[in-house]
Interface confidence: medium
Amino acid sequence: TQNKALPENVKYGIVLDAGSSHTSLYIYKWPAEKENDTGVVHQVEECRVKGPGISKFVQKVNEIGIYLTDCMERAREVIPRSQHQETPVYLGATAGMRLLRMESEELADRVLDVVERSLSNYPFDFQGARIITGQEEGAYGWITINYLLGKFSQKTRWFSIVPYETNNQETFGALDLGGASTQVTFVPQNQTIESPDNALQFRLYGKDYNVYTHSFLCYGKDQALWQKLAKDIQVASNEILRDPCFHPGYKKVVNVSDLYKTPCTKRFEMTLPFQQFEIQGIGNYQQCHQSILELFNTSYCPYSQCAFNGIFLPPLQGDFGAFSAFYFVMKFLNLTSEKVSQEKVTEMMKKFCAQPWEEIKTSYAGVKEKYLSEYCFSGTYILSLLLQGYHFTADSWEHIHFIGKIQGSDAGWTLGYMLNLTNMIPAEQPLSTPLSHSTYV
């Protein structure tokens, strides 16, 4: 007789990543009896919420409920009804909301209040919405990629589960690029972390980790662009800004009020004799690179070594996973291959930025112009940040792996956040049973 399949004993969790430019909902699934095993949680769904980041709803909070509806309804479809009430929902807001909170704590609270009420309208176990710190964002990103790469498992494998997995237990560093901030997180080699703010201690699966992390607020790709524009318009002789970071022939009108709306441009703010200015692209990688470097203050360092803006950075160590916008931008530019050297990446960026805007629009007809127009800047910014900001070199470039997904799960902070909040990463190594009831002999 045929054995009847037993009902799956699984659990689900939902995390919403409320980023500066958009919100994404992730659904995770894992076998209930293996909660403490490493590598058992995997992503079953990603739903990108239509519209901007939640911080943009500050003047229209009544629209937040409608904004979240489609993805929350999707979660209701994906997760079996019998599991709804046991499924935790977490929302973490990142740098976009950190910036809003800097401007007005009351407005940020108001947005989060409405988000909380909207999410409480669903049949899940809503656990709260909060603005996570930059340190948490870095730490959870690091936990995610190392969990998915199997780095916390004590069992060394003779086979590789992902292309860039090495069999040793050396953890990967994490490089995360968002719209409003960027994080660098790794375990330095026998190096004391000179600034306590950048030091994290974890005990995971019976092993201690001393981790360095820093989040650079305002150095996500979108805010970095606003910074660059605000810096460059200071020295423009009129309301025309000839910009090397945009393709030749590209034109766009920018409102000065929009430019100075973000706290990230405050240091460059000045009274201008015009309300609007026009960006005119000239498409020159080298000049764009030089302009970006002016955003990094490397003249001051109170430590043995710094990244930029006086922030301590230990010597880089080991392999790094670069994800989120690091991956999306480099993937678009077709530069994620392990075989592409840093010199080759630079060469290709020079060619890409020099391509006329009309040509670019024709070549990438399906891509929204707003995004398409910014790839030259974003690609150049990524190179500048990694090379001059974090001190990667042509040699160490090969240690950067541009990662979108690992084992079908997106690289990013959300999985690590959920693992932590659901207590699924034990401090000690779980006692392994000779045969679990899911093992067949």
Epitope: G65, E106, R110, D113, V114, R117, S120, N121
Partner: antibody
């Protein structure tokens, strides 16, 4: 106009259950949470729980978690509150009250039912 | 849970008097407080929401102020029809909580 009309007074014995209904009219039923609040004789107001009519999602005051059950029938825009294992100190007026979901200016209780008197006596 | 401490629990005043009731929240509730009037045998009636916004049709002698943790409800000139019990309600946290109530009587 917006109205919440509750079912009539009930007299119950200790240990029994009571189910109170609250029929909504004059607004979109699924756009507001329905809260249940009770007031014991000569006492203040205490909330029992709330339900989101669009999904059936509920939240209970810990004090009532194991005895109160909130349900809705969206086809007739009616909310129900059932209280089981009644005791004499459950004698009270039970109110339903709506609270907006989406906009922070609507979160308070702006419309209340007329109240249902439940008397628990042996 | 957020606790709301309302005072006084009862007060006696004359027609035309200025009457003040206070509510103190155990934590910051922004401006998410409402004030209700309840007459014997009737359901509570909303007078003010979001600290100071008067409901349509409510007389202007009723007002509210405050933010954070300390809130005040005022009747500028007491009228005979104002005799009732008044409650504050915090709706900042999803677990709403009421004050204990203030019973207002005419001297």
């Amino acid at each position: 106009q917006v109205q919440l009309v509750q079912s009539g007074a009930e007299v119950k014995k200790p240990g029994a259950s009571v189910k109170v209904s609250c029929k909504a009219s004059g607004y979109t039923f699924t756009n507001y949470w329905m809260y249940w609040v009770r007031q014991r004789p000569g006492r203040g107001l205490e909330w029992i729980g709330r339900i989101a009519p669009s999904s059936g999602a509920t939240k209970y005051n810990e004090k009532f978690k194991n005895r109160a059950t909130l349900t809705v029938d969206t086809s007739i825009s009616t909310a129900y509150m059932e209280l089981s294992r009644l005791r004499s100190d459950d004698t009270a007026v039970y109110y339903c009250a709506r609270s907006g979901i989406y906009y922070d200016y609507d979160w308070f209780f702006d419309v209340w039912g007329q109240g249902t008197t439940v008397t628990v006596s042996s | 849970d957020i606790q709301m401490t309302q005072s006084p629990s009862s007060l006696s005043a004359s027609v035309g008097d200025r009457v003040t009731i206070t509510c103190k929240a155990s934590q910051d509730i922004n401006k998410y407080i409402g004030w209700y009037q309840q007459k014997p045998g009737k359901a509570p009636k909303l007078l003010i929401h979001y600290t100071s916004t008067l409901q349509p049709g409510v007389p202007s002698r009723f007002s509210g102020s405050g933010s954070g943790t300390d809130f005040t409800f005022t009747i500028s000139s007491l009228q005979p029809e104002d005799i009732a019990t008044y409650y504050c309600l915090q709706y900042h946290a999803l677990l709403f909580t009421f004050g204990q109530g203030t019973k207002l009587e005419i001297k």
